[in-house]
Structure formats: structure tokens, C-alpha cells
Interface confidence: low
């Protein structure tokens, strides 16, 4: 039932995050008269759409409407009816759809077209569905966490306590891990960004920011696993793959056609004398780590320094918020505590990966086996990516904060995306021209 009390002078916005493994709908709310204040927008609802990511609907686009129904109906319930028509809805698709577009632009367009038609049927102000770039994904994630942490303004914040308080306005870097890509975004210290593709310039609340960002397509946790399997099966002597990234006693049959379905495994593709192979877990962290490192080409760097695969990366600077799958995986492994050193994380991963599969299944009976089986790989991958990929050290590890929510709002790109598209981040302080969408795309 709708509340008939005096109408609050508030506004709402909806963003759908169409990721590679699933879609989530976020509803944001803010006081109408404080649109340009920093820190006033907050998340009131998250609805996870049941089913896979939208790129998986390529052969069954007619099911997309039903797929989105539950969460869109939830939005109808949460947002007062009087506000429906003026509530903007945005859908941003990320790396799963980027990969589909690489395979076929036509198929990707077809999926987006059906998504748009489905979302247009609701009484909201639908503003479009699009595939956002990796650069945007990194930039919006960086904006989200710094907005929520109150880094863009000296003014009093609407909430009482900011976690990760550092008593200064130095921004946090953003580390985002998805299923198909991973982003690193931060303000380097007095460092020229040697590659123009990785440079962003913003003016927010009267201050200029020179930001470095890069999105590594195919290096999200799910695609990294496909890459690793494709690489390792090349040298397997038969259709048995003894894999150190899965628990001892774990077994799973993989179709070779599924392995080579993604563009991410193309560089490892070869003709195999079998249609299927069986993964047999041996649960060895050190060997798993070594196997993962082979996915990072560190032998070539045309810049003063690189992350991997010849991509420029300036020296790391300041604190970082690590969110999305960085957080979910580390949370499951109970390794998000600020007290846990990198050495302790490694030690815990060694113990975890070595636990027999039957024991793990018993210990985590409520967790779906598909997800449960991959935590050893995912945790090891996170360590490998952060340490060898991005060059964090045992000492700088303490500057990584694994963040799920900040004051009730999920850390991720969606809030930054909405703030930008609704012109709620002014370039000047206190009120002036809002940041235009073209400023950093």
C-alpha cells in the first residue's frame, strides 16, 4: 500500500547493472533540494535478477522480458506511484556484453534491443540501455566510492561516521573485479600518465583530478578461469586435467566446445583429440598461483612500468577500495578484516585449497557447489592479480580495504553512472555546471 502521508520532497533513480554472470537492479533516493550536495544520494534497494547475465539470452531473447519482471515490479512497489514517471531508469551492460559484441555486433544489438523494449513497458522514465566501456566502468566505480566516502567535499556529510576515515581529502583508488573484466582506477602521485587511453581528467566540486584507469577484459574471475583451463588443457597428456586450483577429490566434466565459446580463450585454442575432459582437483595453492601467473605476460612493457600484457600502470598511490567480486570472494573466505596481513591471507588460502572437497561440501552445505568449487581458484586469482598483476606488496596490502557497502550503498559503478547521467556532480563548488557525460568518455 502507498503511504498517504505528506509527500517527501525526494527523488529516485534506477540503475540496472547487466554484468557477465547476473543482473542487479539498484534503486537510489535523494532529497530533491540537495541534488548537488555531495553524499546525499543513497541506495534504498538492491534486487538481484534471477538467472544468468543478459549475454546468455542471445539464443532466447524472447525470455528477457520475463527475466526482468520480478525486479522491475519490485521497483514499482518501492518507489511511490506519484514518482514513477519522473524516475529515470538506466541499464549499463559490462564485459559480458563487450565479449558478445566482439563475437557479433548484431547479436549484441539484438539483446540490447529486446532489453530496451522490455524496460520501456514500465511506468518509469526509461533512459536507455547501452554497453558501457571499460574506462567508464572504472571511472564510475572510482566516483561512487569517493562520493560515498565524502572525498569530494569539505562540507559536513549527511551521515555521521564515514568508514575508512583518513582525515584528508585524498581520494581512494578503486579496484573492481567482475566475472569477465577487472578495473583499476586511481589518482597517481605527480606522475605523467604515459598512455592517453588510460588518462581521465575530471573537475568535480571545484577540484581537478587526473585519474588513471584501465579495464582488463578477460581478466574477471570467471573468464580468467576459462583462460587458465584452456591454457592448461593444451599440455595435458589426455582428457584428465589435474588442477591445483580445485579441492582434492573434486571432479567435473567440461565440454571443449564450452571452453572455446568465449573470445577470452581464443589465444589458447587448439584441436584436441577429445570432446570432453575431466578436471580432477589436487588442491595446491602454490601450483595454482604459478598456473595463474602464466596468464599475465610481464615480459613486454613499452612504458616506464606496466601491470601486465604491456599495459601502463603508474606506481600505486594511497588507499584502495576493493569491491564487487574482490569483496564477495574475500568475504566468503573471511579475509576482509583490516587486521589480516597479506602473509596471513596466503597462509589461509593454502589451508583452504588443501581441504578435501567432501569436507568443504560438508562445511558449506548451504552454498551452491558451482560457486563453492571455485573459491580456491578465485581467492588465489585475487592474490595473484593484486600482487603480481598490480604490484601490491606485503607492505602496501594494508592499503587495500575490501568494501561491500559504504553507508548502506553498494560499492560499484552504478551510483557513479547515475550521478553523472542525472547531472548531480557539479564541476564547481558549491553549485555550477554539472559534469557532462562527455567529460571522460
Amino acid at each position: 500500500t502507498q503511504n498517504k502521508a505528506l509527500p517527501e520532497n525526494v527523488k529516485y533513480g534506477i540503475v540496472l547493472d547487466a554484468g557477465s554472470s547476473h543482473t542487479s537492479l539498484y534503486i537510489y533516493k535523494w532529497p530533491a533540494e540537495k541534488e548537488n550536495d555531495t553524499g546525499v544520494v543513497h541506495q534504498v534497494e538492491e534486487c538481484r535478477v534471477k538467472g544468468p547475465g543478459i549475454s546468455k539470452f542471445v539464443q532466447k531473447v524472447n525470455e528477457i522480458g520475463i527475466y526482468l519482471t520480478d525486479c522491475m515490479e519490485r521497483a514499482r512497489e518501492v518507489i511511490p506511484r506519484s514518482q514513477h514517471q519522473e524516475t529515470p531508469v538506466y541499464l549499463g551492460a559490462t564485459a559480458g556484453m563487450r565479449l558478445l559484441r566482439m563475437e557479433s555486433e548484431e547479436l549484441a544489438d539484438r539483446v540490447l534491443d529486446v532489453v530496451e523494449r522490455s524496460l520501456s513497458n514500465y511506468p518509469f522514465d526509461f533512459q536507455g540501455a547501452r554497453i558501457i566501456t571499460g574506462q567508464e566502468e572504472g571511472a564510475y566505480g572510482w566516483i561512487t566510492i569517493n562520493y560515498l566516502l565524502g572525498k569530494f567535499s569539505q562540507k559536513t556529510r549527511w551521515f555521521s561516521i564515514v568508514p575508512y576515515e583518513t582525515n584528508n581529502q585524498e581520494t581512494f583508488g578503486a579496484l573492481d573485479l567482475g566475472g569477465a573484466s577487472t578495473q583499476v582506477t586511481f589518482v597517481p602521485q605527480n606522475q605523467t600518465i604515459e598512455s592517453p587511453d588510460n588518462a581521465l581528467q575530471f573537475r568535480l566540486y571545484g577540484k581537478d583530478y587526473n585519474v588513471y584507469t584501465h579495464s582488463f577484459l578477460c581478466y574477471g574471475k570467471d573468464q580468467a578461469l576459462w583462460q587458465k583451463l584452456a591454457k592448461d588443457i593444451q599440455v595435458a597428456s589426455n582428457e584428465i586435467l589435474r588442477d591445483p586450483c580445485f579441492h582434492p577429490g573434486y571432479k567435473k566434466v567440461v565440454n571443449v566446445s564450452d571452453l572455446y565459446k568465449t573470445p577470452c580463450t581464443k589465444r589458447f585454442e587448439m584441436t584436441l583429440p577429445f570432446q570432453q575432459f575431466e578436471i580432477q582437483g589436487i588442491g595446491n595453492y602454490q601450483q595454482c598461483h604459478q598456473s595463474i601467473l602464466e596468464l599475465f605476460n610481464t615480459s613486454y612493457c613499452p612504458y616506464s612500468q606496466c601491470a601486465f600484457n604491456g599495459i601502463f600502470l603508474p606506481p600505486l598511490q594511497g588507499d584502495f577500495g576493493a569491491f564487487s567480486a574482490f569483496y564477495f570472494v574475500m568475504k566468503f573466505l573471511n579475509l576482509t578484516s583490516e587486521k589480516v596481513s597479506q602473509e596471513k591471507v596466503t597462509e589461509m588460502m593454502k589451508k583452504f585449497c588443501a581441504q578435501p572437497w567432501e569436507e568443504i561440501k560438508t562445511s558449506y552445505a548451504g552454498v551452491k557447489e558451482k560457486y563453492l568449487s571455485e573459491y580456491c581458484f578465485s581467492g588465489t586469482y585475487i592474490l595473484s592479480l593484486l600482487l603480481q598483476g598490480y604490484h601490491f606488496t606485503a607492505d602496501s596490502w594494508e592499503h587495500i580495504h575490501f568494501i561491500g557497502k559504504i553507508q548502506g550503498s553498494d560499492a560499484g559503478w552504478t551510483l557513479g553512472y547515475m550521478l553523472n547521467l542525472t547531472n548531480m556532480i557539479p564541476a564547481e563548488q558549491p553549485l555550477s555546471t554539472p559534469l557532462s557525460h562527455s567529460t571522460y568518455v
Epitope: F332, N334, S337, K339, S341, M348, E359, S363, Y364, G366
Partner: antibody
Framework: QVQLVQSGAEVKKPGASVKVSCKVS????????MHWVRQAPGKGLEWMGR????????KYAEKFKNRVTMTSDTSTNTVYMELSSLRSEDTAVYYC????????????WGQGTMVTVSS | DIVLTQSPALAVSPGQRATITCRTQ??????????MNWYQQKPGQPPKLLIY???SLASGVPARFSGSGSGTDFTLTINPVEADDTANYYC????????FGGGTKVEIK
């Protein structure tokens, strides 16, 4: 090898305060949550509270909230527990203990400090 | 506070199985992890961790000790019992800060 060495036994009068120290060697106290647990003669273990020496943040059991103060000194790698308004029922052995990863192994315990409250 | 209730005492012959139970007032599971630990304490000594996370054996502890359970009901099993196992045994939750059970006194007949 990490070791926790506590201060010696104390005898106090009712109404007085006692301050017990716990010096850690072999690792920095900032790597841990430091807990205090007490045990009255012939009784069970009773958790009193913990301190996060990295940020001087404390959490106390409801029962002790108004009487206990936990502090730390990172320069000497020592944590302290002060209990005020002592009464005879506070006679107990007081232990300090580390907790590195919340919910995982409690790595180390001190040898205990006997505090006797008697008039 | 999460209240933990233990069986108070147990007498068992060497070579037999000893089963100590602990019930929690509310669940100590969180995100698939069970925050239940078991300690052994002998007179004049600090407690010694035996089992953490309900079923993981602490380093240096003999495999005769095992832990099981989830949610609100937990068991510490010693099989086979040895004379040296005479001690008090405590369950402890660390899901929400710490709380200890009242202890179970195990005597070897």
C-alpha cells in the same frame, strides 16, 4: 615465536582499581585483536572485552562496560586492562589472548595474572 | 550476548568415546562459516585451542579430537579417550565477539 607475558599477581582492597599488563613479543600487537578473559577460582571462562590496538577501538562485555578500560601502547607492544571499583567477586585469574583473523585460530594466550580482592 | 549451554560433567573409561555437547541460543553461522571453537584447560594453565570453525583441528592437536555441528548444536568428540585428557572443556562462539560455555569437566575412570 609469539609470546604473551603478563604482569605479576596483585592483591587489592575492595573499591580499588587494578591494572594488568600483557607484553607481546615476536609480532606487533597491531596485527591482532587483543582479548581479556577472566576465570574465578573453580569457575568457567568469562570474556571481558577486546581492543584493536591499531585504532584503539574497544568492545566490552555488557557486564564490565562501566568498570573496565582496555588500552594499548604500540611503542612497547603492550596491552593493558584496568578494572575499577573492585569487589571480592572480581578475585580471578585474568588472561590476555590474541585473535588474528576473527573466528579463526586464537593464536596465543598469556600465562594469566592472579588478582585477589580482599579487605 | 549469545548464550552457550554445555553438559556439565562426564566420566569415561580410557579407550572409550567421550562426547561433549554445546548448544547456542542463536545461530553462530555467518556467510557459510561456523564460528564455534573448543578449548581444553588443565588446572593452573591457560586454555588451549583444540578445534576452531566448528570442525578444524588446531595445529599440534591429536586427531583423537574432532568437532562437528552447525547452527546451534555442536559436539566435541574425543575418541579414544586417554588418561591425559582429564580437563575442563569449553565451547566458545566468535561470531559476535566472544562468549564461552560454562565448561564440561571430563574425568577418566
Amino acid at each position: 615465536q609469539v609470546q604473551l607475558v603478563q604482569s605479576g599477581a596483585e592483591v587489592k582492597k575492595p573499591g580499588a582499581s587494578v591494572k594488568v599488563s600483557c607484553k607481546v613479543s615476536g609480532d606487533s600487537i597491531t596485527a591482532y585483536f587483543m582479548h581479556w578473559v577472566r576465570q574465578a577460582p573453580g569457575k568457567g571462562l568469562e570474556w571481558m572485552g577486546r581492543i584493536d590496538p591499531d585504532h584503539e577501538r574497544t568492545k566490552y562485555a555488557e557486564k564490565f562496560k562501566n568498570r573496565v578500560t582496555m588500552t594499548s601502547d604500540t611503542s612497547t607492544n603492550t596491552v593493558y586492562m584496568e578494572l575499577s571499583s573492585l569487589r571480592s567477586e572480581d578475585t580471578a585469574v585474568y588472561y590476555c589472548a590474541t585473535e588474528r583473523v576473527p573466528g579463526f585460530e586464537t593464536d596465543y594466550w598469556g600465562q594469566g595474572t592472579m588478582v585477589t580482592v580482599s579487605s | 550476548d549469545i548464550v552457550l549451554t554445555q553438559s556439565p560433567a562426564l566420566a569415561v573409561s580410557p579407550g572409550q568415546r567421550a562426547t561433549i555437547t554445546c548448544r547456542t541460543q542463536q545461530t553462530v553461522d555467518h556467510y557459510g562459516t561456523t564460528y564455534m571453537n573448543w578449548y581444553q584447560q588443565k588446572p593452573g594453565q591457560p586454555p588451549k585451542l583444540l578445534i576452531y570453525l566448528a570442525s578444524s583441528l588446531a595445529s599440534g592437536v591429536p586427531a583423537r579430537f574432532s568437532g562437528s555441528g552447525s547452527g546451534t548444536d555442536f559436539t566435541l568428540t574425543i575418541n579414544p579417550v586417554e588418561a591425559d585428557d582429564t580437563a575442563n572443556y569449553y565451547c566458545q562462539q566468535s561470531r559476535n565477539l566472544w562468549t564461552f560455555g560454562g565448561g564440561t569437566k571430563v574425568e577418566i575412570k
